[in-house]
């Protein structure tokens, strides 16, 4: 549809999201020095985060730190923080990795390990690898709604990707439902060529694309949605360069007057819906 | 990733001089912090010098003014100059480098051995009375 006549325009557009599914969680915790399997459901509320742009999150995986409180203790053991005298611990240092203000005492860790004591929110968060397979695997069985709407305000022209009689039971498919808003998390993946279960473990960053070619003349008009995905964060990133997507958030509460916190660091999808085109009229 | 290869070992009397030479293979040598280390028979591994990519050292106190450590990033080698030997000073003496290239090993931290990845397999330093 690009005629040499027609007046272009770029598309300005605004992007509401829904998510929708439930993933049953079995969490393998230890209670007074037993493993014991805890069988959860999460919602939406428990998956999703607000974010701000044109982007969604859902959790696939996650680590928790319990019972945290600020006190003196030993610093996980790592290279950085295992220690043979108080020489190897400096007071009031703060190592960009470390998590906690160094004190300058070297003391037991567990058996004849010694670390650096901090103070910090203790007991230190381990280093540790993310759950194999996802928590949230199921997650690629979650629905994601997206509402889109577009304007070409030098030619009063507005509309959206979502048209009066939609069925809103149906799903994405590039070749026999590719107007359908609703798309399959796992069926995004599998257009980019990636396998959810795997990206799912470390998170990652994907892209959906929406791409308006509008031809915006009475008499040849036409102005849908063309939906494509890209995998947008590196899949080669070795360990060193902390692979996929994840962040620490904190859940904070009350115990016998004492403020105390639950540490997750989360691991999951962020979807990046990135909207482009051009409107053109005569 | 680096391989260390320790020379310059033997048998030197008391009060004698012995130079060891620490060879690393791997082209971002100058990223990496240099350490000796020696262990004696039923003894711990102890820390000798050290010297950092930007040239800070750090010495025992066993060794302090006896021994000098150095870096030729040139010829990826870091000597270690001993000086004064005594039969205490008998040892397996180990090379270790310690990447820094995502941080810089703190100068407090340059006597630890966990700071340290690679290893080399030791030269023998006999000092007889």
């Known amino acids: 549809s690009d005629k040499l006549y027609q007046r272009k325009e770029p598309v300005i557009s605004s992007v509401h999201t829904k998510v929708k599914g439930i993933a049953e969680v079995k969490e393998e915790i230890v209670e007074n020095g037993v493993k014991k399997l805890v069988h959860s459901v999460f919602d939406t509320a428990d998956y999703t985060f607000p974010l701000q742009g044109n982007s969604f999150f859902v959790m696939t995986n996650f680590l928790k730190t319990e019972g945290q409180e600020q006190r003196l203790c030993p610093e996980y053991p790592t290279r950085r923080t295992l220690c043979s005298s108080d020489r190897g611990c400096k007071k009031g240092w703060m190592d960009p990795q470390s998590k906690g203000i160094q004190t300058g005492r070297c003391v037991v860790y567990e058996g004849n390990q010694k670390t650096c004591e901090v103070s910090a929110w203790c007991p230190i968060e381990a280093v540790e690898e993310a759950p194999r397979p996802a928590l949230l695997n199921s997650a690629e069985n979650f629905t994601v709604l997206i509402k889109n709407n577009i304007d070409f305000p030098g030619h009063n022209y507005t509309t959206r990707n979502i048209l009066p009689g939609l069925n809103i039971t149906c799903t994405f498919h590039k070749t026999q439902n590719p107007q359908c808003p609703i798309f399959r998390l796992g069926d995004i993946f599998r257009e980019t060529g990636d396998n959810f279960s795997d990206v799912a473990i470390q998170g990652g960053i994907m892209g959906i694309e929406i791409y308006w070619d509008c031809n915006l003349d009475r008499w040849f008009h036409h102005c849908r949605p063309k939906y494509s995905f890209r995998r947008l964060d590196d899949k080669t990133t070795n360990v060193s360069l902390y692979p996929g997507y994840n962040f620490r958030y904190a859940k904070y509460y009350k115990e016998n007057n004492v403020e105390k916190r639950t540490l997750i660091k989360v691991f999951g999808i962020r979807f990046d819906i990135l909207v482009f085109g051009t409107g053109g009229k005569f | 990733e680096v391989q260390l290869v320790e020379s310059g070992g033997g048998l030197v009397q008391a009060g004698g001089s012995l130079r060891l030479s620490c060879a690393a293979s791997g082209r971002t040598f100058r990223h990496y912090a240099m350490g000796w280390f020696r262990q004696a028979p039923g003894k711990e591994r102890e820390f000798v010098a050290a010297?950092?990519?930007?040239?800070?050292?750090d010495y025992g106190d066993s060794v302090k003014g006896r021994f000098t450590i150095s870096r030729d990033d040139a010829k990826n080698t870091v000597p270690l100059q001993m000086n004064s030997l005594k039969p205490e000073d008998t040892a397996v003496y180990y090379c270790?480098?310690?990447?820094?290239?995502?941080?810089?090993?703190?100068?407090?931290?340059?006597?630890?051995?966990?700071?340290?990845?690679?290893w080399g397999q030791g030269t023998q330093v006999t000092v007889s009375s």
């Open positions: 010297i950092s990519s930007y040239g800070s050292t």
């Open positions: 270790a480098a310690a990447d820094e290239t995502l941080g810089a090993v703190p100068n407090f931290r340059l006597h630890e051995k966990y700071e340290y990845e690679y």
